[in-house]
Interface confidence: low
C-alpha cells in the first residue's frame, strides 16, 4: 500500500522537511504533488512526467519545493502557512490512479524566556508572590524549575494560567531559591535565566552563646548574640533591664558578683519591623557552687538505654572530675566524657551500672563533691530458676517449689502446671502429692516495667518406682592425656542413693577417679586408653533400685611409635620388599612411606618387586591421628645386597 | 602488645566449605566484639558480621545471614568464619578486627594480615 | 543501613601540598552529639591502618599531619603537607549502628 511518511513530523519554522513515499507501484506514467486532502488542480504543488523526466509546477508551487525521482517530495525554509496535508498523486502505465496522503506540524522557534515578578521583597509568611513566564507563546508548554528541580508538591505553590504563572502563597524563608521556567514546543525548549526570590524574614528568636550561665569571680564574660533575620538584624544588650550597647557581642572584663543578674539581647530587623528578644540569667560565684548531677534517664532499661549524667552548673575554665562507686572511672568502651568532663555517658547500661555516680568541681583550695547519685537501672528478669533441682519424689511427700529472676523491679510470679494457671506466688506448696501431681511445672516471671517475660519449665515426676536412670558426658571422645570426662547420672531424685559401675565392677580406687555431687558425678582425670570401659550408674532409693543402660568411653589415642614388620633389614637382590606398619591408635591412623625422604603411597603396606642394590636407604613410615592431631614415625634401613655375596641378617 | 593471627591462604573448588581463624594475643577476646570485613580484588571494604565472644551472639549483614558463620572459642582466644556454598563471588581477602574494649571509641585500630580465599575449579 | 558516599573517587596532589577528601553520610552517624565516623588508610596489600577515629582524634602513633573534621553527615579527612608514603586508598566508616558500613574509598596518587 502506497504511504506517505514525514520526516520530520513536527517541522521548525526555517527548517525542511521530506515528504519520504513508501511502496511506490513500478511502471509509472508520473505523479503529482497537492496540498490538502485531496487532489485539486487548484492546489497542484508540482507534477512529474517519468518518461520526459520533466517536473511542471502548480498553483501552489513556491519556489521551495524539489521533487525526487522516487515521487519524495522536500520542502525548504518551512514556513508557518505549510502546517497540514500533502496528497500524493500516483499516475500508472496502465493509467489507474493511486493515491496516499501525510502531513506535517510547522511550529515557530521558541524565543529565550524571561520571568517577571509582583513582589521583590515579599515577607514571610505575610505576603505571595506571582511569578509569570513571558512571553505568551501559543502551543507552547510552560515548566517551572526551583533550584534546577522540577517543583515539589506543595499546597502553598499553584500554578495557572496555563502554567504560565506560578504563585507562592505565605512565602517563607525556604523559598528562598533559584527559579526558572521552560517554554516547550515540539521543536524547542528553552529556559530563563535564573531569578533568585529574595524573602524578608525574622528576626527569630535571639540564641545567646556561650549557653554557660555560671562564672566564677574575676573571669572576662564575652555573651554573643545572634538571630536568623533577613536582612540581618541589628543587636541591643539590657543589663537588668538598662540599655547597655547597640553591638552584636557584650564584653565586660574581670566580673565580680555584682555582674549577677538578667541580660537581654534584643534584635530588630529593620525591613519586617518586628523586635524579638531573649534573657539569660548570668550567676557570677565567688567560689565555684557545691555541683550537682543531672540525667537525662532517670529509670534507663538494661542493654537498651544510654544514661548521660552532667555536672551542674556548668563554669568557664574548670576542671570537672568523676567518681563510681568512690573511685576514679575505670576504663570502659561504655564510659563516655565530653570533651570538657561535664557529661558522663554510660553506653548501653547493664545492671552493674548503679553507682553511686559522684562528680566534682575542681577550685583553687580543694574539690567540691556533689551527692551521690544512684542509677534505678531495669533489668531482667533473667531466666527463673526453680529449686530445689530434683525431678523426682515419691507419693506422700510435700512438694514444695520456690522461682527465683533477677530482675528490677522485683518480678511478679506466676505458676503453671501442665499449661494451666495455679497461683500468682514465688513459691508453690502442694501437700501430700500423688501419681496425679507428675507434669510439666512452669514458672513464669514478669518485670511490670520493662514488660519482659521469662519463663522455665521443670518436669516432675512422682513416682514410687525409680526411673531407669541414663549417664550424660560432657565429652563424647575425649583424648588420652589430655582430657577429662564427667559422667552425671541422671536425673536427679530427691533421698536416692547414687551408684556406679566400671565393666560390671565397683569402682577401683584411683586418684583420677572423682565422685562428687552426691555421687552423682564420676569424673576421670587424664584419661588413658585402659579408660575404655562399660560404664553403668545406679540409682536406689528405701522401696526401689535402678541400673542405666551401660556407656562405653571412647578415648582417642595414638598413633604410638609405629613397628614395621618383618624385622629383616638385609635382603638379597631379586627378592620382593613387603614391609607393613602398624601403629596403636584410636581412631585407625593415616598411614604413608618414605624411602630416603621421598614421598610414597598413603598404605599401611610397602611393597616393591624384585629389589636390586638402588633400592638400599632408609625407610620411613608416618602415622598421623586426625582426631587427636598427634603424629609418629619410625625408621628402617634397608640393605640389598647383589645375588651371590651371602647377606648377614640382621634385626 | 595486641596480635591477630589468622590462618594461611585457602584455595578452594566451588560449592565446597571453608572455615578461617583468627587468633588473639595481647587480650582476652570474652573483653571485646570480634568482627570480620570482606575485600574482593581491587575493591573496597565490606562488613560481614561480628561475634560478642563472651556470650556467642553473633550479628551479620542480610546478604551475609546463611553464607558465613562467626564463632568463638574463647579457651583458644581464636575467632572463626566459616563461609559455605563458595562461588566465585567469594574469592577475597578476609580480616579479622577487634572491636570495643581495647579500642578507643569503638574503632577499629588492629587488624589481623588478612587470609585469601580463592575460588576456583 | 547507612550509606557513606566517599569523594572524590581519585586524587592527584603534589608532594608538599594539602590533600582533602569527603565522607557523606546518608544519615547522622552522631551519638550524644559525636561522629562515630573513622579513618582507615589501606596500602596494597596490607590491611587497613587506623588514622583518625571519632571524627577528629588521632590515633597514637600517625603523624599529625592527618586531621579529621566534621558531624552529623558530613566529614573530612586532611592531609597537610602530602608526603610520597601517603599513597594509599583512604575509607571512612561508621559504627554509629549495624551494620557498620564503610564508604567506596579515595585514592590518593602524587602528580
Known amino acids: 500500500k502506497l504511504t506517505i511518511e514525514s520526516t520530520p513530523f513536527n517541522v521548525a519554522e526555517g527548517k525542511e522537511v521530506l515528504l519520504l513515499v513508501h511502496n511506490l507501484p513500478q511502471h509509472l506514467f508520473g505523479y503529482s504533488w497537492y496540498k490538502g486532502e485531496r487532489v485539486d488542480g487548484n492546489r497542484q504543488i508540482i507534477g512529474y512526467v517519468i518518461g520526459t523526466q520533466q517536473a511542471t509546477p502548480g498553483p501552489a508551487y513556491s519556489g521551495r519545493e524539489i521533487i525526487y525521482p522516487n515521487a519524495s517530495l522536500l520542502i525548504q525554509n518551512i514556513i508557518q502557512n505549510d502546517t497540514g496535508f500533502y496528497t500524493l498523486h500516483v499516475i500508472k502505465s496502465d493509467l489507474v490512479n493511486e493515491e496516499a496522503t501525510g502531513q506535517f506540524r510547522v511550529y515557530p522557534e521558541l524565543p529565550k524566556p524571561s520571568i517577571s515578578s509582583n513582589n521583590s521583597k515579599p515577607v514571610e509568611d505575610k505576603d505571595a508572590v506571582a511569578f509569570t513566564c513571558e512571553p505568551e507563546t501559543q502551543d507552547a508548554t510552560y515548566l517551572w524549575w526551583v533550584n534546577n528541580q522540577s517543583l515539589p508538591v506543595s499546597p502553598r505553590l499553584q500554578l495557572s494560567n496555563g502554567n504560565r504563572t506560578l504563585t507562592l502563597f505565605n512565602v517563607t524563608r525556604n523559598d528562598t531559591a533559584s527559579y526558572k521556567c521552560e517554554t516547550q514546543n515540539p521543536v524547542s525548549a528553552r529556559r530563563s535565566d535564573s531569578v533568585i526570590l529574595n524573602v524578608l524574614y525574622g528576626p527569630d528568636a535571639p540564641t545567646i552563646s556561650p549557653l554557660n550561665t555560671s562564672y566564677r569571680s574575676g573571669e572576662n564574660l564575652n555573651l554573643s548574640c545572634h538571630a536568623a533575620s533577613n536582612p540581618p538584624a541589628q543587636y541591643s544588650w539590657f543589663v537588668n533591664g538598662t540599655f547597655q550597647q547597640s553591638t552584636q557581642e557584650l564584653f565586660i572584663p574581670n566580673i565580680t558578683v555584682n555582674n549577677s543578674g538578667s541580660y537581654t539581647c534584643q534584635a530588630h530587623n529593620s525591613d519586617t519591623g518586628l523586635n524579638r528578644t531573649t534573657v539569660t540569667t548570668i550567676t557570677v560565684y565567688a567560689e565555684p557552687p557545691k555541683p550537682f548531677i543531672t540525667s537525662n534517664n532517670s529509670n534507663p532499661v538494661e542493654d537498651e538505654d544510654a544514661v548521660a549524667l552532667t555536672c551542674e552548673p556548668e563554669i568557664q575554665n574548670t576542671t570537672y572530675l568523676w567518681w563510681v562507686n568512690n573511685q576514679s572511672l575505670p576504663v570502659s568502651p561504655r564510659l563516655q566524657l565530653s570533651n570538657d568532663n561535664r557529661t558522663l555517658t554510660l553506653l548501653s547500661v547493664t545492671r552493674n551500672d548503679v553507682g553511686p555516680y559522684e562528680c566534682g568541681i575542681q577550685n583553687k583550695l580543694s574539690v567540691d563533691h556533689s551527692d551521690p547519685v544512684i542509677l534505678n537501672v531495669l533489668y531482667g528478669p533473667d531466666d527463673p530458676t526453680i529449686s530445689p533441682s530434683y525431678t523426682y519424689y515419691r507419693p506422700g511427700v510435700n512438694l514444695s517449689l520456690s522461682c527465683h529472676a533477677a530482675s528490677n523491679p522485683p518480678a511478679q510470679y506466676s505458676w503453671l502446671i501442665d499449661g494451666n494457671i495455679q497461683q500468682h506466688t514465688q513459691e508453690l506448696f502442694i501437700s501430700n502429692i500423688t501419681e496425679k501431681n507428675s507434669g510439666l511445672y512452669t514458672c513464669q516471671a514478669n518485670n511490670s516495667a520493662s514488660g519482659h517475660s521469662r519463663t522455665t519449665v521443670k518436669t516432675i515426676t512422682v513416682s514410687a518406682e525409680l526411673p531407669k536412670p541414663s549417664i550424660s558426658s560432657n565429652n563424647s571422645k575425649p583424648v588420652e592425656d589430655k582430657d577429662a570426662v564427667a559422667f552425671t547420672c541422671e536425673p536427679e531424685a530427691q533421698n536416692t542413693t547414687y551408684l556406679w559401675w566400671v565393666n560390671g565392677q565397683s569402682l577401683p580406687v584411683s586418684p583420677r577417679l572423682q565422685l562428687s555431687n552426691g555421687n552423682r558425678t564420676l569424673t576421670l582425670f587424664n584419661v588413658t586408653r585402659n579408660d575404655a570401659r562399660a560404664y553403668v550408674c545406679g540409682i536406689q532409693n528405701s522401696v526401689s533400685a535402678n541400673r542405666s543402660d551401660p556407656v562405653t568411653l571412647d578415648v582417642l589415642y595414638g598413633p604410638d611409635t609405629p613397628i614395621i614388620s618383618p624385622p629383616d633389614s638385609s635382603y638379597l637382590s631379586g627378592a620382593n620388599l613387603n614391609l607393613s606398619c602398624h601403629s596403636a591408635s584410636n581412631p585407625s591412623p593415616q598411614y604413608s612411606w618414605r624411602i630416603n625422604g621421598i614421598p610414597q603411597q598413603h598404605t599401611q603396606v610397602l611393597f616393591i618387586a624384585k629389589i636390586t642394590p638402588n633400592n638400599n636407604g632408609t625407610y620411613a613410615c608416618f602415622v598421623s591421628n586426625l582426631a587427636t592431631g598427634r603424629n609418629n614415625s619410625i625408621v628402617k634401613s634397608i640393605t640389598v645386597s647383589a645375588s651371590g655375596t651371602s647377606p648377614g641378617l640382621s634385626a | 602488645e595486641v596480635q591477630l593471627q589468622q590462618s594461611g591462604a585457602e584455595l578452594v573448588e566451588p560449592g565446597a566449605s571453608v572455615k578461617l581463624s583468627c587468633t588473639a594475643s595481647g587480650f582476652n577476646i570474652k573483653d571485646t566484639y570480634m568482627h570480620w570485613v570482606k575485600q574482593r580484588p581491587e575493591q573496597g571494604l565490606e562488613w560481614i558480621g561480628r561475634i560478642d565472644p563472651a556470650n556467642g551472639n553473633s550479628k551479620y549483614v542480610p546478604k551475609f545471614q546463611g553464607k558465613a558463620t562467626i564463632t568463638a572459642d574463647t579457651s583458644s582466644n581464636t575467632a572463626y568464619l566459616q563461609l559455605t556454598s563458595l562461588t566465585s563471588e567469594d574469592t577475597a581477602v578476609y580480616y579479622c578486627?577487634?572491636?570495643?574494649?581495647?579500642?578507643?571509641?569503638?574503632?577499629?585500630?588492629?587488624w589481623g594480615q588478612g587470609t585469601s580465599v580463592t575460588v576456583s575449579s | 543501613d547507612i550509606v557513606l558516599t566517599q569523594s572524590p573517587a581519585s586524587l592527584a596532589v603534589s608532594l608538599g601540598q594539602r590533600a582533602t577528601m569527603s565522607c557523606r553520610a546518608g544519615?547522622?552517624?552522631?551519638?550524644?552529639?559525636?561522629?562515630?565516623l573513622h579513618w582507615y588508610q589501606q596500602k596494597p596489600g596490607q590491611p587497613p591502618k587506623l588514622l583518625i577515629y571519632r571524627a577528629s582524634n588521632l590515633e597514637s602513633g600517625i603523624p599529625v599531619r592527618f586531621s579529621g573534621t566534621g558531624s552529623r553527615t558530613d566529614f573530612t579527612l586532611i592531609i597537610d603537607p602530602v608526603e610520597a608514603d601517603d599513597v594509599a586508598t583512604y575509607y571512612c566508616?561508621?559504627?554509629?549502628?549495624?551494620?557498620?558500613?564503610f564508604g567506596g574509598g579515595t585514592k590518593l596518587e602524587i602528580k
Open positions: 544519615e547522622s552517624v552522631d551519638i550524644f552529639g559525636v561522629g562515630f
Open positions: 578486627a577487634p572491636f570495643g574494649y581495647y579500642v578507643s571509641d569503638y574503632a577499629m585500630a588492629y
Open positions: 566508616q561508621q559504627t554509629n549502628e549495624d551494620p557498620y558500613t
